[in-house]
Interface confidence: low
């Protein structure tokens, strides 16, 4: 659409009165790189116009660079220069007479997003039918509105639920928090993949991603590299890791010659079987049994420990 300006030069009313009421609103950010235009248009094109901001009272004059006035556009100024002000107006001097535009109320809007955090952030594993809950938290400066956008493998999912809300932050704080929660009630194999949450404030977008792994059903198995024979010399520390694949993580139990091993100051029987100072009597067959906590499926593996006396 083209705009035609017809100048009716009126030295008693150099600023074009807005059809709206007695004041306007200008929205600004404190971004150092942004300028704002105060739309005090002129009926005379070659006026000497300054911008008055209050409170405290400050006057800005065109500097031929980032501060300028154009009768068809208004007064342009870096927004951070008037971010302190409650109101601004344009002023023209004609024959020692001062003429003022309408008042413009200054409303500072934020834009900075400090970070976007996904929770859980990594290592998400589920089996088919389980519920996936992902929280995306954006921390921003004050006076920011946030739009969340999620990208994930089956974005058309019928069972997904998205809830966005503002989190309460301390009154003395320099930041706001926004939370978006993605819930998929019963995941399928097609829900496996990369989940990305993007938060946008209009001027800035930040995003974060995490990988979700979906298993057909709970399972447990020994991983490759699980040793069958371990050799050691008296006095050494022996570590026998239980290398497994499984979801959810299995319960691990160690046995020696069929007798359950309990952890004490000389032996630690957990994800890794550790014998602090191995002795001749530690020689024997060690069995590790992995139990899936959901399906109760069990897998066992025998490791022979041979201890040499130097």
């Amino acid at each position: 659409a083209s705009v035609i300006y017809v100048y009716v030069q009126d030295y008693r009313s150099p600023f074009i009165a807005s059809v709206s009421d007695q004041h306007g609103v200008v929205y600004i950010t404190e971004n150092k790189n942004k300028t704002v235009v105060i739309p005090c248009l002129g009926s005379i094109s070659n006026l000497n116009v300054s911008l008055c901001a209050r409170y405290p009272e400050k006057r800005f004059v065109p500097d031929g660079n980032r501060i300028s006035w154009d009768s068809k556009k208004g007064f342009t100024i870096p927004s951070y220069m008037i971010s302190y002000a409650g109101m601004v107006f344009c002023e023209a001097k004609i024959n020692d007479e001062s003429y003022q535009s309408i008042m413009y109320i200054v409303v500072v809007v934020g834009y900075r997003i400090y970070d976007v955090v996904l929770s859980p952030s990594h290592g998400i594993e589920l089996s088919v039918g389980e519920k996936l809950v992902l929280n995306c938290t954006a921390r921003t400066e004050l006076n920011v509105g946030i739009d969340f956008n999620w990208e994930y493998p089956s974005s058309k999912h019928q069972h997904k639920k998205l809830v966005n809300r503002d989190l309460k932050t301390q009154s003395g704080s320099e930041m706001k928090k926004f939370l978006s929660t993605l819930t998929i009630d019963g995941v399928t194999r097609s829900d496996q993949g990369l989940y990305t949450c993007a938060a946008s404030s209009g001027l800035m977008t930040k995003k974060n991603s995490t990988f979700v792994r979906v298993h057909e059903k709970p399972f447990v198995a020994f991983g490759s590299g699980m040793e069958s024979l371990v050799e050691a010399t008296v006095g050494e520390r022996v570590r026998i890791p239980a290398k497994y694949l499984g979801y959810p993580p299995p319960e691990i139990k160690w046995y020696k010659n069929g007798i359950p091993l309990e952890s004490n100051h000389t032996i630690k029987a957990g994800h890794v079987l550790t014998i602090m100072e191995v002795s001749e009597r530690d020689t024997g067959n060690y069995t590790v049994i992995l139990t899936n906590p959901i399906s109760k499926e069990k897998q066992s593996h025998v490791v022979s420990l041979v201890v040499y006396v130097p």
Partner: antibody
Framework: QVNLRESGGGLVKPGGSLRLSCAAS????????MNWVRQAPGKGLEWVAS????????FYTDSVKGRFTISRDNSRSSLFLQMNSLRAEDTAIYYC??????????WGQGTMVTVSS | DIQMTQSPSSLSASVGDRVTITCKAS??????LNWYQQKPGEAPKLLIY???ILETGVPSRFSGSGSGTDFTFTISSLQPEDIATYYC?????????FGGGTKLEIK
């Protein structure tokens, strides 16, 4: 070394004015909310005013609204408190304090303001 | 306004004693509560923020707990240098308010 140093206190008559200053050093002043807190002789702490990093938000306690003005100059790492129409009950040590997201973590040593005829 | 009621207003204890101060908020302030120590003639010093987090460099004998409206500040083993007035402060809402203070003395 993070430091806040107040100045500008003194003796003033009721109805008079004073301007307190707080000079900051050792940290990025323009990134923090700044606060004024006062303590009347023998009394507890009372929050007076806060100003956010870019001066976009300013808050006052009810008893000083319309009389006190908090401001800052980030280019000079300075915080100010313009106090007008002073009353006897404004007599106190005035502290400036840095506001982190959670607390007032750095305090100045304070400047004494006495309002008396 | 959120009122902060601190008790006791003063207390006397012996070196090595466990000392407890309580602070009650007139409204739910989640965990936006801080504890400060002020020694005579000095500025206040932050000890604990967010109800229970120890400020860097503060001895571990100081601790804080609580959420909502009821909060507790504890010195596990009182030392002579702990003689001071202690204040709680809420940062949940404007106006920011402090408790009336607890003056701690050595028996």
């Amino acid at each position: 070394q993070v430091n806040l140093r107040e100045s500008g206190g003194g003796l003033v008559k009721p109805g008079g004015s004073l301007r307190l200053s707080c000079a900051a050093s050792g940290f990025t002043f323009g990134s923090y909310t700044m606060n004024w807190v006062r303590q009347a002789p023998g009394k507890g702490l009372e929050w007076v005013a806060s100003i956010t990093s870019g001066s976009s938000y300013i808050f006052y306690t009810d008893s000083v609204k319309g009389r006190f003005t908090i401001s800052r100059d980030n280019s000079r790492s300075s915080l100010f408190l313009q106090m007008n129409s002073l009353r006897a009950e404004d007599t106190a040590i005035y502290y400036c304090a840095r506001g982190s997201a959670s607390a007032f973590d750095i305090w100045g040593q304070g400047t004494m303001v006495t309002v008396s005829s | 306004d959120i009122q902060m009621t601190q008790s006791p207003s003063s207390l006397s204890a012996s070196v090595g004693d466990r000392v407890t101060i309580t602070c009650k908020a007139s409204d739910d302030i989640i965990n936006y509560l801080n504890w400060y120590q002020q020694k005579p003639g000095e500025a206040p010093k932050l000890l604990i923020y967010d109800a229970s987090i120890l400020e860097t460099g503060v001895p571990s004998r100081f601790s804080g707990s609580g959420s909502g409206t009821d909060f507790t500040f504890t010195i596990s083993s009182l030392q002579p240098e702990d003689i001071a007035t202690y204040y709680c402060q809420q940062l949940d809402d404007i106006p920011i308010t402090f408790g009336g203070g607890t003056k701690l003395e050595i028996k």
